[in-house]
C-alpha cells in the first residue's frame, strides 16, 4: 500500500464567521509552522568506553536523534559499514539481534539507542584507536551513520563523550527532497504572514460552480516529489572520521539515551511501530537502506513519519495497515 500525504479540500468559512480569516489563512500557517518546528536533521551519536577492569573490553553506545521509526541498527568497526568496515552486530527492533566476534552482548537500551560490549584477545581484540561506527536505518529519514573512537589519551574507565558526528549517507531523494519541501514551506509561511500583516484577510465565498469546496493554493507535493519519497536511494559513501570531542552532550556522564532535541516531536510509538528491513548476510551489508525504501510503499510502519502535513484533529494517527509479513 502506498501512503502519501493528501492535501484535503478546505471547507469555506461558516456564514456566521463575519470578519474572521478564511480557513486557508488560518490553517495553512499553522500547518507550515508545524512543519518548520518539527523539521530537524536526524543525528546519530556514538560513545566508546574502555572498561577499567579489562583493557581489551569496550562498550559502544549509539543513539538516534530523529523523529522517524528505526528499522535496523548496524554496528561496525574499522570504518563505516560497506566502506571497509566489519559488521559487529545487527539489531532489529522487533526481530532481535545478530552479533559477531568479538561482540559479546548487543542489546537495545531504549527505542532509539543500543549498546554493545566487545571483548577480545589476540587478533579479534579491539585496540584503543579502533573506529566504531553505528548506522541507523530509519523511516522516513533514511540511513544515518556516525563513528567514534577513544581519544588517544583516554584513561581506562573513561569514555569519549557521545559524538554526534554523522556521516552523511543521506537519502538524496528522500532527505533532500523533504528538506527542500520544508524550506519552501517555511519561506511560504513567512510570505503568508507578511501578506497577512499588510492587508486584511478577504472572505472566502463558497464556489457556485462546483459543489466541492474551493481547494486552497496550499503547497502539495508534486508527483515527482511524492515519488521521490518512495525511490530506493543512492548511498553516499564517505570516509569515516574519528569522533570529534565537541559534543552537544555534557562531558560529565552524559545521559546516553540522549536528551531529546526539541525538534524530535514524533517519537516511534513502540516496538510495533518499527518497519522491517531486509538484512543481507554480514559480508554484504552494502545498502540496507535500499530495501527499506523499496518496501516503504508496501509496508508502512504503524506510526506515520515525523512529517505531519495536515494534523488530524484526533492527534497523530497511525498509518493504516499492519506491518507486512512475507
Amino acid at each position: 500500500m502506498r501512503t502519501e500525504a493528501q492535501v484535503p479540500a478546505l471547507q469555506p468559512p461558516e456564514p456566521g464567521l463575519e470578519g474572521a480569516m478564511g480557513h486557508r489563512t488560518l490553517v495553512l500557517p499553522w500547518v507550515l509552522l508545524t512543519l518548520c518546528v518539527t523539521a530537524g536533521t536526524p543525528e546519530v551519536w556514538v560513545q566508546v568506553r574502555m572498561e577499567a577492569t579489562e583493557l581489551s573490553s569496550f562498550t559502544i553506545r549509539c543513539g538516534f536523534l530523529g523523529s522517524g521509526s528505526i528499522s535496523l541498527v548496524t554496528v561496525s568497526w574499522g570504518g563505516p559499514n560497506g566502506a571497509g568496515g566489519t559488521t559487529l552486530a545487527v539489531l532489529h527492533p522487533e526481530r532481535g539481534i545478530r552479533q559477531w566476534a568479538p561482540a559479546r552482548q548487543a542489546r537495545w537500551e531504549t527505542q532509539s539507542s543500543i549498546s554493545l560490549i566487545l571483548e577480545g584477545s589476540g587478533a579479534s581484540s579491539p585496540c584503543a584507536n579502533t573506529t566504531f561506527c553505528c548506522k541507523f536505518a530509519s523511516f522516513p529519514e533514511g540511513s544515518w551513520e556516525a563513528c567514534g573512537s577513544l581519544p588517544p589519551s583516554s584513561d581506562p574507565g573513561l569514555s569519549a563523550p557521545p559524538t554526534p558526528a554523522p556521516i552523511l549517507r543521506a537519502d538524496l531523494a528522500g532527505i533532500l527532497g523533504v528538506s527542500g519541501v520544508l524550506l519552501f514551506g517555511c519561506v511560504y509561511l513567512l510570505h503568508l504572514l507578511r501578506r497577512h500583516k499588510h492587508r486584511p484577510a478577504p472572505r472566502l465565498q463558497p464556489s457556485r460552480t462546483s459543489p466541492q469546496a474551493p481547494r486552497a493554493r496550499a503547497w502539495a507535493p508534486s508527483q515527482a516529489s511524492q515519488a521521490a519519497l518512495h525511490v530506493p536511494y543512492a548511498t553516499i559513501n564517505t570516509s569515516c572520521r574519528p569522533a570529534t570531542l565537541d559534543t552537544a552532550h555534557p562531558h560529565g556522564g552524559p545521559s546516553w539515551w540522549a536528551s531529546l532535541p526539541t525538534h524530535a516531536a514524533h517519537r516511534p510509538q513502540g516496538p510495533a511501530a518499527w518497519a522491517s528491513t531486509p538484512i543481507p548476510a554480514r559480508g554484504s551489508f552494502v545498502s540496507v537502506e535500499n530495501g527499506l525504501y523499496a518496501q516503504a510503499g508496501e509496508r508502512p510502519p504503524h506510526t506515520g513519519p515525523g512529517l505531519t502535513l495536515f494534523p488530524d484533529p484526533r492527534g497523530p494517527r497511525a498509518m493504516e495497515g499492519p506491518l507486512g509479513v512475507r
Epitope: G96, I97, P278, G283, S284, V325
Partner: antibody
C-alpha cells in the same frame, strides 16, 4: 532444492576431538549464515553458534566457547564444527541450520549428525 | 540468559481437535520468537517465524500469536501427522534459547 547434508554418525573416545560437516546446496552459499544446534538425548535444543560464510565471522553461545569451533570452506560450500575435549555430556545429535538474514529465522535444517562419546 | 518456558511437556488431543501450545519468555522478546516441529527421528522443521508469520508450505492450520513474553502456537483441525515435539525459540538476545518442548500425542 535447498539442502544441508551433514556427515555421518561419530563414535569417539573421551578427551578426543571430532569434526563434523554440513554441506550446503541449492542456494547461494554466501547469502545465508549457518548456525549449529545441539540436541541431547531426550532433551531440548541448545544454540551453539553461527558462522558467516562470507568472511568466516563467528558468534558463539558462551557455554560452547572453547568447546566448539566453527569454520567454513567456501569452495566446497561446507561448514564445519569441531568439538574438542569430548566428554559424555557432548553425546548428542548436532544440527546445522540455515539462517534467513532478511527474516531472522532458521528456514532449513540439516539432516543431523549423531556424536557418541564412549570409552 | 532468556529462559523460554513451555509449561506443558505433554499434550494429548484427538484428530480434528484444536490445541494451543504456549511458550513464556523470562523477559520481553518483542516478536523474536519462532516455532519448530520435530517428528520422531527427524530434523526440526520450521513452522512459524517472527511470532506469527507462517513459513512457506506450512498448512494454515498452524497459527502463531503473541508478543512480548507470551506466545502461542495453535493447531486447529489436528491431523495424525501432527504427532511431534514442538519447540519455541527466542532470538531477541544472545544466546538464543529454545523452550523445553511440548510433545503432542494424538489419540
Amino acid at each position: 532444492e535447498v539442502q544441508l547434508q551433514q556427515s555421518g554418525p561419530e563414535l569417539v573416545k573421551p578427551g578426543s576431538s571430532v569434526k563434523i560437516s554440513c554441506e550446503a546446496s541449492g542456494y547461494t552459499f554466501a547469502d545465508y549464515n549457518v548456525d549449529w544446534v545441539k540436541q541431547s538425548h531426550g532433551k531440548s535444543l541448545e544454540w551453539i553458534g553461527a558462522i558467516n560464510p562470507n568472511d568466516g565471522g563467528t558468534s558463539y553461545n558462551q557455554k560452547f566457547e572453547g568447546k566448539a569451533t566453527l569454520t567454513v570452506d567456501k569452495s566446497s560450500t561446507t561448514v564445519y564444527m569441531e568439538l574438542r575435549s569430548l566428554t559424555s555430556e557432548d553425546s548428542a545429535v548436532y544440527y546445522c541450520a540455515r539462517w534467513v538474514n532478511n527474516d531472522w529465522y532458521f528456514d532449513v535444517w540439516g539432516t543431523g549428525t549423531t556424536v557418541t562419546v564412549s570409552s | 540468559d532468556i529462559v523460554m518456558t513451555q509449561s506443558q511437556k505433554f499434550m494429548s488431543t484427538s484428530v480434528g481437535d484444536r490445541v494451543s501450545i504456549t511458550c513464556k519468555a523470562s523477559q520481553n522478546v518483542r516478536s523474536a520468537v519462532d516455532w519448530y516441529q520435530q517428528k520422531p527421528g527427524q530434523s526440526p522443521k520450521t513452522l512459524i517465524h517472527s511470532a506469527s508469520s507462517r513459513h512457506t508450505g506450512v498448512p494454515d492450520r498452524f497459527t502463531g500469536s503473541g508478543s512480548g513474553t507470551d506466545f502461542t502456537l495453535t493447531i486447529s483441525n489436528i491431523q495424525s501427522e501432527d504427532l511431534a515435539d514442538y519447540f519455541c525459540l527466542q532470538h531477541w538476545n544472545y544466546p538464543y534459547t529454545f523452550g523445553g518442548g511440548t510433545k503432542l500425542e494424538v489419540k
